[in-house]
Interface confidence: medium
Amino acid sequence: AGLKLMGAPVKLTVSQGQPVKLNCSVEGMEEPDIQWVKDGAVVQNLDQLYIPVSEQHWIGFLSLKSVERSDAGRYWCQVEDGGETEISQPVWLTLVPRGSSAHHHHHHHHSAWSHPQFEK
């Protein structure tokens, strides 16, 4: 599986209290089970959404409603492929205090889309 994190830089800096959406694109697999991981622990998100771009291309989403200090860390996505776990390149999420101007490089794979999630 060609696994890559789409539309996110290696380092992502956001202001405290702001929302963040991460996209993970998986190519070369049919119906992958995309899981998000933060600092080694799977991120529970009951409304985990996947968009099929094509039969062999899927995008998974992780959305944080309101970023706080505890959300800072290293994020990646992973899929199981033939009994082996493949992981994406990580993204480091760092915070600046509320009201500061964050150098926000985050770019959505489809910036116009709105994907319902539970995290603010």
Partner: antibody, heavy 125, light 108 residues
């Protein structure tokens, strides 16, 4: 057209086992999660749990953990809710629910939630 | 276990603004969804992600969230808006979801 077809109403005695079903059509079954919601007569909605069919990953509400089992059969695009031993307090309407996206003309997919019509389960001696 | 708290009932006259609240400790971090259920029918999604109106829902329905409180507002309530309304969200760690107890809206 997206459809969730639920199995018909059922009457059981306490202690009996039961499985109700929710068959999906009109979309790729494994795209999104399916959840189950209980509504006792004249009462509110209760989230029971859900399954991600592609991985058969499940989550349960604290009140339902250990009392029901949620499963899915990808070959028939069907989700199931199962009891090993029913109690009178399980008498309720049970709904299955799933989200889906639909793009109508533009590039922005609209978010929908589809609810099945419900299955009425009556447990009585 | 995690709970979402709603008032049992809200009454307004036709044309007035109805506000239904939902409080929960995790709402600063978790989005609220709102459902409308009319008698004998399955619920219908009204608002998702705090404030986004679901497809086919009239513009008089709006949602907002601040701190531990989410609010569903119906501006200019109509008789046909009489229904039970439920908020819905997740507990803080995302392990399970919950519905609020429901609010019966009466439009007299």
């Amino acid at each position: 057209e997206v459809q969730l077809v639920q199995s018909g109403a059922d009457v059981k005695k306490p202690g009996a086992s039961l499985t109700i079903s929710c068959q999906a059509s009109g979309y790729t079954f494994t795209d999104y999660w399916i959840s189950w919601v209980r509504q006792k007569p004249g009462k509110g909605l209760e989230w029971m749990g859900q399954i991600v069919p592609r991985a058969s990953r499940t989550n349960y509400g604290p009140s339902f953990q250990g009392h029901v089992t949620i499963s899915a059969d990808r070959s028939t695009a069907t989700a199931y809710l199962q009891w090993r031993s029913l109690e009178a307090s399980d008498t309720a309407m049970y709904y299955c629910v799933r989200p889906y996206f639909q793009t109508s003309g533009g590039t922005i997919p609209e978010y929908y939630q589809h609810w099945g019509p419900g299955t009425l389960v009556t447990v009585s001696s | 276990s995690y709970e979402l708290t709603q008032p049992p009932s809200v009454s307004v006259s036709p044309g007035q603004t109805a506000r239904i609240t939902c409080s929960g400790d995790a709402l600063p971090k978790k989005y609220a969804y709102w459902y409308q259920q009319k008698s004998g029918q399955a619920p219908v999604l009204v608002i998702y992600e705090d404030e986004k109106r679901a497809s086919g829902i009239p513009e008089r329905f709006s949602g907002s969230s601040s701190g531990t409180m989410a609010t569903l507002t119906i501006s200019g309530a109509q008789v046909e808006d009489e229904a039970d309304y439920y908020c819905y969200s997740q507990e803080r760690n995302g392990n399970y979801a919950v519905f609020g107890g429901g609010t019966k809206l009466t439009v007299l």
